[in-house]
């Protein structure tokens, strides 16, 4: 039993535990009652979203439109915010009742669909404190958490998970690959009060671990001892020259020698041509530079390893996960090729609820979406084949006409006679 029991004297302890779904963590005690839904947006009320979401006041920024795209599982349910202009920055945000995730789990979830076959563009969200001026949200606006997929060229196809810790944006040390196809995908970030995290794509875990291990929030636990240095007599040479080995007396021979078979040409005129010198050839007896044989070094101590000490700068922080204030969700993006659709935003404290919500939204329409896309692709293939056939037919017709123009006029004879005369149909 944990020390938690001391807090509850008398009967009904198990009932309390059960009813409140109390979970005990070493650093924190937190209650998980009804799921708290801090923010939820499915764009199911037509243009209603325009009153909830605020655009940055800048004319050259891209416009979001409400759309379910070129293909979908359910035309109404799959409506979301779609980027509509190429090579633009986008800045759009929605506020909610501010909350703190201290002592509880934080789940951030949304769907992204890059139906444009994206080449370079963001698909991530940022969670800001409520102090953000939404009309002036930009790339340098300080946020708490940034999460989601990002694609740019062949080199970047990743899920960003960035935490602002003590005023600094800290990037994850792992490479989490995002989906780069044209379908809708569900992205989930879970941050727990025991300083662990989980990233899910399509409700399946793709990464998990400890915040302290996978981000450089804190100085390292160990550092190289600054007072230690390699001793002067430390010998790192595994092999040395054999001191007893000596060069054979007949070793030194020139690399090149005059060709013994060469003869002075008969027409050589020393007055005109100078003194004749035979051409040089490689000396077959040349042995190269002599090197003494190698033996094991009796003084070899191995590679010197710098000893480590506890880092005096290091101190653990049990509240890395915690933020005092979340109040705005923002899309602050650049897209070369537009067409990305964002939908089914959810911020909650309940992992199970988020999973359920994902299954009821993305989960319900994903198969039908694929079906519609496959059908469109098939129709496109058929159209392409038809176009190719028509083109071929036109080309054959044109060739026939050309041949007729080129050939002499045909005599009016029967087919049989024509064939006998060697005329062939084009």
């Amino acid at each position: 039993s944990s020390s938690l029991e001391v807090l509850f004297q008398g009967p009904g302890l198990n009932d309390i535990f059960e009813a409140q779904k109390i979970e005990w963590h070493e650093e924190n005690l937190y209650f998980q009652g009804e799921p708290a839904v801090y923010f939820k947006e499915q764009f199911l009320d037509g243009d209603g979203w325009t009153s909830r979401w605020i655009e940055k006041h800048k004319s050259d920024f891209g416009k979001f439109v409400l759309s379910s795209g070129k293909f979908y599982g359910d035309e109404e349910k799959d409506k979301g915010l779609q980027t509509s202009q190429d090579a633009r920055f986008y800045a759009l945000s929605a506020s909610f009742e501010p909350f703190s995730n201290k002592g509880q789990t934080l789940v951030v979830q949304f769907t992204v669909k890059h139906e444009q076959n994206i080449d370079c563009g963001g698909g991530y969200v940022k969670l800001f404190p409520n102090s953000l001026d939404q009309t002036d949200m930009h790339g340098d606006s300080e946020y708490n958490i940034m999460f989601g997929p990002d694609i740019c060229g062949p080199g970047t196809k990743k899920v960003h998970v960035i935490f602002n810790y003590k005023g600094k944006n800290v990037l994850i040390n792992k490479d989490i690959r995002c989906k780069d196809d044209e379908f809708t995908h569900l992205y989930t970030l879970i941050v727990r009060p025991d300083n662990t995290y989980e990233v899910k794509i399509d409700n399946s875990q793709v990464e998990s671990g400890s915040l302290e291990d996978d981000w450089d929030f804190l100085p390292p636990k160990k550092i190289k001892d600054p007072d230690a240095s390699k001793p002067e007599d430390w010998d790192e040479r595994a092999k040395i020259d054999d001191p007893t080995d000596s060069k054979p007396e007949d070793w030194d021979k020139p690399e090149h020698i005059p060709d013994p078979d060469a003869k002075k040409p008969e027409d050589w005129d020393e007055e005109m041509d100078g003194e004749w010198e035979p051409p040089v050839i490689q000396n077959p007896e040349y042995k190269g530079e002599w090197k003494p044989r190698q033996i094991d070094n009796p003084d070899y101590k191995g590679t010197w390893i710098h000893p480590e000490i506890d880092n005096p700068e290091y101190s653990p922080d049990p509240s890395i996960y915690a933020y005092d204030n979340f109040g705005v969700l923002g899309l602050d993006l650049w897209q070369v090729k537009s067409g990305t659709i964002f939908d089914n935003f959810l911020i909650t404290n309940d992992e199970a609820y988020a999973e359920e919500f994902g299954n009821e939204t993305w989960g319900v329409t994903k198969a039908a979406e694929k079906q519609m896309k496959d059908k469109q692709d098939e129709e496109q293939r058929t159209r392409r084949m038809m176009r190719t056939k028509m083109r071929m037919r036109r080309m054959r017709r044109t060739r026939r006409k050309m041949r007729r123009k080129m050939s002499p006029a045909r005599p009016r004879t029967s087919c049989r006679e024509a064939c006998l005369q060697g005329w062939t149909e084009a």
Partner: antibody
Amino acid sequence: QVQLVQSGAEVKKPGSSVKVSCKASGGTFSSYAISWVRQAPGQGLEWMGGIIPIFGTANYAQKFQGRVTITADESTSTAYMELSSLRSEDTAVYYCASSPLRGSGWYWHYYYGMDVWGQGTTVTVSS
Amino acid sequence: SYELTQPPSVSVAPGKTARITCGGNNIRSKSVHWYQQKPGQAPVLVVYQDSKRPSGIPERFSGSNSGNTATLTISGTQAMDEADYYCQVWDSSTAVFGGGTKLTVLG
């Protein structure tokens, strides 16, 4: 990894302009930010400005605003830095340097440092 | 505008640990990068994002960043480490370099 090759040394008269080129090879030009950094004889490094070819717009240090123009030609994977109204104090080695973007936002290169540098172009301003 | 302050010179005996500091207002909130420059050569990135080493940079180079000071540490300093070292950060979309520190390896 990308390699950067700069144009040759230049000798210029005060009041004139100089245009230095920086050609990238061995990487995707659009996935880098290109910075221009200069170093006067015996002095430290000084950032002049930079450009992210995929975004097109350049960014300049306050000190050089209005006198420097940085451009990029994606078709030839070449970045250019033009400095006008030259004076003797502009005598320096001019370097181009690239930082990987590793993301679609223009701020990504902040995190990665200038990991590849050109060989430098010496510009001498003298009457 | 943001300023970075480095000591003009630092001396170290071979095999010992060299520390080069870079001071800036609340520098811990920024990503600090360090460059090494040898005479007549272009700078080389030795540490990025405070403490990460690019491939090919020896393990003896490390970095840290807290409060108002970032530090480049070279443990087991070698004669070949003698060079100028510059710290750099980004501030309001502008790159800022420190004035540079000349590292002398004695002996």
